[in-house]
């Protein structure tokens, strides 16, 4: 009788992560008597995948009933495949021996390749905000995909970016891979509503790429422009001075009025108006009692925006033209805070 052969008809099998892999194996004879075992890899470090008589293999089922007397089909199914299962699987026939069974013949092996989808790309921007005209870096990461081939693109508001660097790790063979890309983006004053998108295309995604986004509103700081103007006299001895704070982002802003360098009032921007580009405008006004001043008054509008160093704008108020009112000691009325917005 011809010597037993172990036949693994499939040189390779390709399975998607999460699915079941079928590894086929048949023997050409019932002799010698002894069990079949499945291993991943060869040599002393090989991993036991299935032993028909002993051990716990909850993910493995046999295709046929191995207890049938003349069974020669030793194919197995491995459920819930992950990239870690990739490798070459060997169907090995043992013959009964003492004390241990002895390896008799091995199949040629079946290479199991696992296709695994990349994780949703995660886009992260710089830790600190930056102002228009500055270049900032965004990173995009996606993990756990196989095979290694992958395409990554960057977009800003639908326009493809070209200034980026991408790495796929590891460089050598692995059960799964990760991609890391860094893109450089130049900020403009109009970027409050802008989005940066990282797009990943992979064979497992069937032409429907995965996208990760970052809103530039989290990254940009648009500093305000200030304008201080003197309004027509409201009443005798009173002058209304306004400070227009325009085109700032984010909203966090504190304004201080100074009269001749002395703090008169501090307020926080609350009821702001939003511009079409996502920036904000705000206005504060100060009612100055000119009769309380003998000399000209220097009024300063000082703004601290988003924790940055203060910027200021001054206005010189001439008081010589106004008659002096005796006995008045109030330089400014603190009720002069106005949260209406005037353009």
């Amino acid at each position: 009788e011809e010597e037993l052969q172990v036949i693994q008809p499939d040189k390779s099998v390709l399975v998607a992560a999460g699915e079941t892999a079928t590894l086929r194996c048949t023997a050409t004879s019932l002799i010698p008597v002894g069990p079949i075992q499945w291993f991943r890899g060869a040599g002393p470090g090989r991993e036991l995948i299935y032993n028909q008589k002993e051990g716990h293999f909850p993910r493995v089922t046999t295709v046929s009933d191995l207890t049938k007397r003349n069974n020669m089909d030793f194919s197995i199914r491995i459920g819930n495949i992950t990239p870690a299962d990739a490798g070459t699987y060997y169907c090995v026939k043992f013959r009964k021996g003492s004390p241990d069974d002895v390896e008799f013949k091995s199949g040629a092996g079946t290479e199991l390749s696992v296709r695994a989808k990349p994780s949703a790309p995660v886009v992260s921007g710089p830790a600190a905000r930056a102002t228009p005209q500055h270049t900032v870096s965004f990173t995009c990461e996606s993990h756990g995909f196989s095979p290694r081939d992958i395409t990554l693109k960057w977009f800003k508001n639908g326009n493809e970016l070209s200034d980026f660097q991408t790495n796929v790790d590891p460089v050598g063979e692995s059960v799964s891979y990760s991609i890391h890309s860094t893109a450089k983006v130049v900020l403009t004053r109009e970027d409050v509503h802008s989005q940066v998108i990282c797009e990943v295309a992979h064979v497992t995604l069937q032409g429907d790429p995965l996208r990760g986004t970052a809103n530039l509103s989290e990254t940009i700081r648009v500093p305000p422009t200030l304008e201080v103007t003197q309004q027509p006299v409201r009443a005798e001895n009173q002058v209304n001075v306004t400070c227009q704070v325009r085109k700032f982002y984010p909203q966090r802003l504190q304004l201080t009025w100074l009269e001749n360098g002395n703090v008169s009032r501090t307020e926080t921007a609350s009821t702001v108006t939003e511009n079409k580009d996502g920036t904000y405008n705000w206005m504060s006004w100060l009612l100055v009692n000119v009769s309380a001043h003998r000399d000209d008054v220097k009024l300063t509008c000082q703004v601290e925006h988003d924790g940055q160093p203060a910027v200021s704008k001054s206005h010189d108020l001439k008081v010589s033209a106004h008659p002096k009112e005796q006995g008045s000691n109030t330089a400014a009325e603190n009720t002069g805070s106005n949260e209406r917005n005037i353009y």
Partner: antibody, heavy 114, light 108 residues
């Protein structure tokens, strides 16, 4: 569900033999080996041997080679472990376990005393 | 035969603490053939970990296994009251199959 039901407690005199049974249900009896493991009072686990229910093939721990016999009855899906020439040190709980090491019998207490 | 030596023999710990149990083999054991069991008084052993590091069905993930060659470890990250028991390592790499002497994890 998988069950391994063992025979009841036994009290034996030194020099006698004891035969413990283990009836399997809920799975294909010939699928995997059946092992016998014992545990003396306050001691650890000790592997005695195994039988292949498909063909009766056995492997014994050399320590028990001369005194243990494992058999099976496929018609009743039952395996047996017989231990002869009993001595006081054989007082233990005897377990049968399926080849997957997940399913164990409830244990059979064998007391050897004169 | 492959002798499995477990240490320590007894581990006295409080609930919430981390337990690290060692199993050393007298000769190399392939990772696929190293199992761990938990046993409570009057009960049969219960399979905890198979193939060195895989959790058996229904075993909480505070249990983990690691190791290779001759050194294997069972770790319980945060002891729960029901974890106080005796733990055994076991090899079925070669005949005769053998068990370690056991480590008793007791309440401090």
């Amino acid at each position: 569900q998988v069950q391994l039901v063992q025979s009841g407690a036994e009290v034996k005199k030194p020099g006698a033999s004891v035969k413990v049974s283990c009836k399997a249900s809920g799975f294909n009896f010939e699928d995997t080996y059946m092992h016998w493991v014992r545990q003396a009072p306050g001691q650890g686990l000790e592997w005695m041997g195994r039988i292949d229910p498909a063909d009766g093939d056995t492997k014994y721990n050399p320590k028990f080679q001369d005194r243990v016999t494992m058999t099976r009855d496929t018609s009743t899906s039952t395996v047996y472990m017989e231990l002869s020439s009993l001595r006081s040190e054989d007082t233990a709980v005897y377990y049968c376990a399926r080849g997957n090491y997940v399913n164990w019998g409830q244990g059979t207490t064998v007391t050897v005393s004169s | 035969e492959i002798v499995l030596t477990q240490s320590p023999g007894t581990l006295s710990l409080s609930p919430g603490e981390r337990a690290t149990l060692s199993c050393r083999a007298s000769s190399s054991v392939s990772s696929s053939y190293l199992y761990w069991y938990q046993q409570k008084p009057g009960q049969a052993p219960r399979l905890l970990i198979y193939s060195t590091s895989n959790l058996a069905s229904g075993i909480p993930d505070r249990f983990s296994g690691s190791g290779s060659g001759t050194d294997f470890t069972l770790t319980i990250s945060r002891l729960e009251p029901e974890d106080f028991a005796v733990y055994y390592c076991h090899q079925w790499y070669s005949y005769p199959r053998t068990f370690g002497g056991g480590t008793k994890v007791e309440i401090k």
